[in-house]
């Protein structure tokens, strides 16, 4: 297992809506043929898998069916959203990068970005 | 010119086991992926799964998990698709398919499930 | 699993008319693409990522939308234009297609 560089934005605030983005880029020794990306929820010493996807020539990635989770890769950079997220989602969102072929193998991971989320103050009630 | 031929036409028996193959040539075979989609008579288009060639990496759409296994033979640039426990609904035309847009298609395979 | 509802599933029309074909997904998708299938063929790639023509794909074929309701818009029929027509989906496993829209001459 080879080390990869993998840069990320410090911090991200998610909008009104719940839908944060950001960029993870890697930097890659050689021409990939199949990379798999990870995003991986740091909260409390406690580390999760958000989602993942593996992709190959096309600029979209494909995750699960249930995923909260789209993106679209060109070059070295890959474009992530994350969806749905409220306040209590707030952590260290880290981008794990594998090149999984050609060999070797690369394995990269980005120091995080902070998403902060805010829930949307309710409407107010009105007379109208 | 990239090309994906497949295997011939097959006539099986309910709850035998069939497996096709796609050769592919014309382009780097590790650099695409592999699709597999079904198309019973009539009817609309199916997607089965999907295989990475270099390193194996499968996908399947939970409907054939279990029934259906797709592998690959980097040496021959050929993949192939094993479909088991057959019943007569799995009659169809399967073609396989190149890379994320499908852009290149096989001339499609005919399964005919028959006692 | 992202259904794709196209309409109409029949549509009959003559050479020289303009048509639209509808794809709407159940949950918004980042892009659609559409292929063509005549009788005992496999299906052929028309666009990508909602409107990028493929190669050798004559330009009265178009795409566009975005979220969940896409268009494939046909500007003058052509006699070798009647066929099924497919959208598909690949932001979520599993990837999905339409039913299919059956172009018939009128």
């Known amino acids: 297992c080879k080390a990869m560089h993998v840069a990320q934005p410090a911090v991200v605030l998610a909008s009104s809506r719940g839908i944060a983005s950001f960029v993870c880029e890697y930097a890659s020794p050689g021409k990939a043929t199949e990379v798999r990306v990870t995003v991986l929820r740091q909260a409390d010493s406690q580390v999760t898998e958000v989602c993942a996807a593996t992709y190959m020539m096309g600029n979209e990635l494909t995750f699960l069916d249930d995923s909260i989770c789209t993106g679209t890769s060109s070059g070295n950079q890959v474009n992530l959203t994350i969806q749905g997220l409220r306040a209590m989602d707030t952590g260290l969102y880290i981008c794990k990068v594998e090149l999984m072929y050609p060999p070797p193998y690369y394995l990269g991971i980005g120091n995080g970005t902070q998403i902060y989320v805010i829930d949307p103050e309710p409407c107010p009630d009105s007379d109208f | 010119q990239v090309q994906l031929v497949q295997s011939g036409a097959e006539v099986v028996k309910p709850g035998a086991s069939v497996k096709v193959s796609c050769k592919a040539s014309g382009y780097t075979f590790t650099s695409y992926w592999i699709n597999w989609v079904k198309q019973a008579p009539g009817q609309g288009l199916e997607w089965m799964g999907r295989?990475?060639?270099?390193?194996?990496?499968?996908y399947y759409n939970e409907m054939f998990t279990g029934r259906v296994t797709l592998t690959r033979d980097t040496s021959t640039s050929t993949a192939y698709m094993e479909l088991s426990s057959l019943r007569s609904e799995d009659t169809a035309v399967y073609f396989c398919?190149?890379?994320?847009?499908?852009?290149?298609w096989g001339q499609g395979t005919m399964v005919t499930v028959s006692s | 699993d992202i259904q794709l509802t196209q309409s109409p599933s029949f549509l009959s029309a003559s050479v020289g008319d303009r048509v639209t074909i509808t794809c709407s997904a159940s949950k918004s998708v980042s892009y659609i693409h559409w292929y063509q299938q005549k009788p005992g063929k496999a299906p052929k790639l028309l666009i990508y990522d909602t409107s990028t023509l493929a190669s050798g794909v004559p330009s009265r074929f178009s795409g566009s939308g975005s979220g969940t309701e896409y268009t494939l818009t046909i500007s003058s029929l052509q006699p070798e234009d009647f066929a099924t027509y497919y959208c598909?989906?690949?932001?979520?496993?599993?990837?999905?297609f339409g039913q299919g829209t059956k172009l018939e001459i009128k």
């Open positions: 398919a190149r890379g994320d847009y499908f852009d290149y």
């Open positions: 598909q989906q690949r932001t979520t496993y599993p990837l999905t």
């Open positions: 295989i990475a060639p270099g390193s194996g990496t499968t």
